[in-house]
Interface confidence: medium
């Protein structure tokens, strides 16, 4: 793990990787790209899944936050032997199945998908891929696409959330390393701190939520600050302002001293949440303090 920038966001990260025949001689570059990127997501609350697709989609590693399982998943990924067609929609299907299942279990964790492909999709396969990506979005996912070599950028812009969610790699597979920093910067949504972190019991406050990526939402009007109080009740508040590195939010009035509110952020109106280890606590404030 080579220092440098990292992401502290707590969300579910899905890698959907093309293992069709055309990447046969470039699988090492794809693997090293994923391995280096995976090591940069360091929150203990971040879960990761590896999905590969060719003529069918396979979940190589189910969602896990266990670093040992992720290490083993990367070993399995390194052993993949590419071959077959580019059924990208099958990869999205495997991601949607997991997101759907997690939602059903009551885990409303935000999902980020990074899909990598190297070729243009034939019309009906593109149709299915766009449709399945929309299904993932419907379930709350943010979708990024990495296109290498012979990709069609217009297609990928429709599969991803927007043109800004596409990372074109025009100089071949060896150039994948060069986009790690920009992918990390764009795909990372993280909550780093809250100011103030201690508020007066029974009083109304505004909280500045510091972090990164808050404007990566498809629609910034759908960004919410969420306060999970004493691990039970969750209160969502619309921020007064949304900037990439901070949110200005009304804090809920917490009546008793010693109450704790864990901070979360939703990018999609409460459909799913980015978690953090940032806690706001209440204290007793005497008059005039």
């Amino acid at each position: 793990e080579d220092g440098g920038p990292a992401c502290y966001g707590g969300f579910d990260l899905y890698f959907i990787l093309d293992k069709s025949g055309s990447v046969l001689h470039h699988w090492n570059e794809i693997y090293y790209f994923v391995e280096q990127l995976a090591h940069k997501f360091i929150s203990p609350q971040l879960r990761m899944s590896f999905i590969v697709f060719s003529t069918r989609g396979t979940t190589l590693m189910k969602l896990t936050e266990d670093r040992e399982q992720i290490r083993q998943g990367l070993e399995e990924l390194q052993k993949v032997l590419p071959g077959g067609d580019t059924y990208m929609h099958e990869g999205f299907e495997r991601a949607s199945e997991q997101i759907y299942y997690e939602n059903r279990q009551g885990y409303r964790t935000a999902s980020v998908i990074i899909a990598l492909t190297d070729g243009e999709l034939h019309e009906d396969l593109f149709f299915y891929s766009e449709r399945e990506a929309n299904r993932s979005r419907d379930l709350g996912a943010i979708v990024y696409c990495v296109g290498v070599k012979d990709f069609n950028e217009t297609q990928l812009a429709r599969i991803a959330d927007s043109k800004d969610h596409v990372f074109p790699v025009n100089d071949g597979f060896q150039a994948l390393q060069g986009i790690i920093h920009s992918i990390l910067k764009k795909s990372c949504i993280e909550i780093l701190a809250a100011e103030p972190s201690t508020i007066c019991a029974g009083e109304s406050f505004q909280v500045v939520v510091r972090g990164n990526g808050f404007r990566h939402a498809r629609n910034v009007d759908r960004v919410l600050c969420s306060f999970k109080i004493n691990d039970s009740v969750t209160l969502n508040e619309k921020p007064f302002s949304v900037e990439d590195t901070y949110l200005l939010c009304p804090a809920p009035i917490l009546k008793e001293v010693g109450m704790k509110a864990a901070l979360q952020v939703s990018m999609n109106d409460g459909l799913s949440f980015i978690s953090s280890s940032v806690i706001i606590t209440t204290t007793h404030c005497s008059d005039g303090s």
Partner: antibody
């Protein structure tokens, strides 16, 4: 409000070619997918195919090479051509919009009834 | 092609009845199943998408359920204006296919 309207002949002779037009208002055919669906006497619905926002087409293999779907973006119209018509092609022909976000046909034309008879 | 089978072919009901229309797919189509209503001399109208998602403007008495290969459309209190033919549609794979329809009649 999006509206679709089919137009074309109501009577076609066997072996002739059917040409239908779908005129779209309230949306551009350079977004989404634009379809043809037909309903046979007895209520059976058959999906015929689409032309996409980019001009690509998909056609039902059951219609083999008889079918062609084209468009004119300047008129915001798309077209159906069905060759070698037989009495089996007697049906009401609908044009419909399909959005991948919903994966369903959310807006339909009123339909035009075509009879194949000599 | 995926074959969609609807039952019953005809359903005769009394206003206020709760009815259930069935649709079966010949293979797993997840929840890519849509329901349409077609009244006499009108074009089909989308009622339910993705097996159970409601459509704005459609009365709340219409609901859908199911996933995989077995689906149902429920009307919890039939009204006289609900007469027509109800179709299910496979939205999973090409060529898209429709069920044969269930004709709803009022006694």
């Amino acid at each position: 409000e999006v509206q679709l309207q089919e137009s074309g002949p109501s009577l076609v002779k066997p072996s002739q070619t059917l040409s239908l037009t779908c005129s779209v208002t309230g949306d551009s055919i350079t977004s989404d997918y634009w379809n043809w669906i037909r309903k046979f006497p007895g209520n059976k619905l058959e999906y015929m195919g689409y032309i996409s926002y980019s001009g690509n087409t998909y056609t039902n293999p059951s219609l083999k090479s008889r079918i062609s779907i084209t468009r004119d973006t300047s008129k915001n119209q798309y077209y159906l051509q069905l060759n070698s018509m037989t009495t089996e092609d007697t049906a009401t022909y609908y044009c419909a919009r399909y959005k991948t976000i919903d994966s369903s046909f959310d807006v339909w034309g009123a339909g035009t009834t075509v009879t194949v008879s000599s | 092609d995926i074959v969609m089978t609807q039952s019953p072919a005809t359903l005769s009901v009394t206003p206020g009845d709760r009815v259930s229309l069935s649709c079966r797919a010949s293979q797993n189509i997840r929840d890519f199943l849509h329901w349409y209503q077609q009244k006499s001399h009108e074009s089909p109208r989308l009622l339910i998408k993705y097996a159970s998602q409601s459509i704005s403007g459609i009365p709340s008495r219409f609901s859908g359920s199911g996933s995989g290969s077995d689906f149902s459309l429920n009307i919890n209190s039939v009204e006289p204006e609900d007469v027509g033919v109800y179709y299910c549609q496979n939205g999973h794979s090409f060529p898209y296919t429709f069920g044969g329809g269930t004709k709803l009649e009022i006694k």
